[in-house]
């Protein structure tokens, strides 16, 4: 079972090798594509391969922008040529996403497929790191192989690679380990029950919040650190502002996603730029501890 | 390795019908666009039907729009014609082709080794 | 529906020739042409797809180049086995062949 997803990728190429890509759809060149092109073909170490978010089968929407749907094969591969001179390609690529049935905690076993020249699209963090502790992924690129396994989401710990244990072993040491990895990765991973945002812990609710600007202020202060997995919480209300007025937000409250982007695995400051950039509406999803009124 | 085998030609009276098939293996039959492509005795090749891979499109020349009906059972491997209102001038090697789209170009890489229809009373 | 003629419509050569065939679209079909091969009571096989790129496992002596109407398949020095009849194939449009070439031994 798998579900859909999109995303954005940037590759850069020249005239002459172009970007590694191949798209199919139709069965001639003119023919008005009624589904979007396919990838149907990924060059070895081509920019299309070595950016690790791409794979045969993938839909390709838009190109630089255009959409691809209703127009033809011919025009697709014009697009591509003529973004080969300007040597960049912007791509928005719809994927398959497995449905893993995955526990919210325990340890299990993640095999990723993998090339020398690929990434895997995970990024490790050693936050706070206490000797002993483990690695912690802090960000799976989207599109990439790790991320379409559907079982890694950032705040798992990550305790080996290919039997290799990571208990002391320095984060640049785990990054060079899984860069030379070839063919499949194994690895050990270790989800615990606090990296669940979904899991309504004890004494604890989440909820969704809107707020519509109409121009003015959120009138609220948050707080955090640049440390990937410390909470985001609301320090600051400003008085009758329109946070406030909603009664549903409180200094103290916990900030899990803004616009339903995950603050999990992100710092303050993305959690701030997520806030500045958020349009009109504003959905900000809540996790509130119940020892005080709602 | 690819083949492809065609079966189902023979004599039919004109007006007749008849229904060729052709049992695909060594590659994922659902991934390709596949072709019926035709020469009549003695002339050149002829294109004459295609399908898309989840057979969701079909394409066909105008000679024999409306008579012809190309399908494709993916769970068999097996690609179909069928032939309807069958004229002299149907008369033909029938050949079955794999049809790809590589490197800006559509092309028939890999063809059955036909089988011979005859229209004629 | 776009046109595809082929010239000569036959030829005689020797083994060791350099022969070159010539395909026209009546209308521009960018690289869209494939050239194939086929001997008498055979199917025909694939050589050149996309105007000049060689089909996997086909001899080096054939080369195809052109783009737009006029397309050139050449046979840089003529083998035994060559002499067969060849065509041309667009996919700009829904697929159309030309009426093939006939390569004979002299």
């Known amino acids: 079972i798998v579900h859909t997803e999109t995303t954005e990728v940037v590759l850069c190429g020249d005239p002459l090798s172009g970007f590694g890509l191949q798209l199919q759809g139709g069965i001639f060149a003119t023919e008005t594509l009624s589904s979007p092109p396919l990838v149907c073909f990924i060059e070895p170490d081509s920019p299309a391969e070595r950016c690790g978010l791409l794979q045969v089968g993938d839909r390709v929407l838009s190109i630089n922008g255009i959409a691809t749907e209703d127009g033809t094969m011919e025009e697709a591969n014009q697009l591509l040529r003529d973004a080969a001179l300007a040597h960049k390609v912007v791509l928005e690529v719809e994927f398959d996403v497995a449905e893993s049935v995955i526990p919210s905690s325990g340890t299990f076993h993640v095999k990723l497929p993998k090339k020398r020249s690929v990434e895997l699209g995970i990024t490790i963090s050693s936050a706070s790191r206490k000797r002993g502790e483990p690695l912690i992924i802090s960000d799976i690129k989207k599109g990439s192989v790790a991320h379409r396994t559907g079982t890694l989401e950032p705040g798992d710990k990550l305790l080996a690679i290919d039997n290799i244990r990571l208990d002391n072993c320095p984060m640049e040491d785990a990054v060079q380990i899984l860069r030379q990895c070839e063919d499949l990765v194994k690895l050990k991973i270790r989800k615990d029950e606090d990296n669940s945002d979904e899991l309504e812990t004890t004494g604890a609710v989440s909820y969704t919040v809107e707020l519509k600007r109409y121009g003015g202020p959120l009138g609220i202060t948050i707080s955090g650190t640049e440390e990937p997995f410390d909470p985001i919480v609301i320090s600051g209300l400003t008085k009758r502002g329109l946070a406030e007025r909603t009664g549903a937000i409180h200094v103290g409250d916990r900030i899990l996603a803004i616009n339903n982007v995950s603050l999990k695995g992100r710092p303050l400051s993305e959690a701030i730029h997520l806030l500045q950039v958020a349009g009109e509406t504003v959905t900000l999803k809540i996790k509130k501890q119940l020892d005080r009124p709602l | 390795e690819v083949q492809l085998l065609e079966s189902g030609g023979g004599l039919v009276q004109p007006g007749g019908s008849l229904r060729l098939s052709c049992a695909a293996s060594?590659?994922?039959?659902?991934?390709?666009?596949m072709s019926w492509v035709r020469q009549a005795p003695g002339k050149g090749l002829e294109w004459v039907s295609a399908?898309?891979?989840?057979?969701?499109?079909?394409y066909y020349a105008d000679s024999v729009k409306g008579r012809f009906t190309i399908s494709r059972d993916n769970s068999k491997n097996t690609l179909y014609l069928q032939m309807n209102s069958l004229r002299a001038e149907d008369t033909a090697v029938y050949y079955c082709?794999?049809?790809?789209?590589?490197?800006?170009?559509?092309?028939?890489?890999?063809w059955g080794q036909g089988t011979l229809v005859t229209v004629s009373s | 529906d776009i046109q595809m003629t082929q010239s000569p419509s036959s030829l005689s050569a020797s083994v060791g020739d350099r022969v070159t065939i010539t395909c026209r679209a009546s209308?521009?079909?960018?690289?869209?042409l494939n050239w194939y091969q086929q001997k008498p009571g055979k199917a025909p096989k694939l050589l050149i797809y996309?105007?000049?790129s060689l089909q996997s496992g086909v001899p080096s002596r054939f080369s195809g180049s052109g783009s737009g109407t006029d397309f050139t398949l050449t046979i840089s020095s003529l083998q035994p086995e060559d002499f067969a009849t060849y065509y041309c194939q667009q996919s700009y449009y829904l697929p159309t062949f030309g009426q093939g070439t006939k390569l004979e031994i002299k």
């Open positions: 399908i898309s891979g989840s057979g969701g499109s079909t």
């Open positions: 996309a105007a000049s």
């Open positions: 082709a794999r049809y790809v789209y590589y490197s800006y170009s559509y092309s028939f890489d890999y």
């Open positions: 060594g590659f994922t039959f659902s991934s390709y666009a």
């Open positions: 209308q521009s079909i960018s690289s869209y």
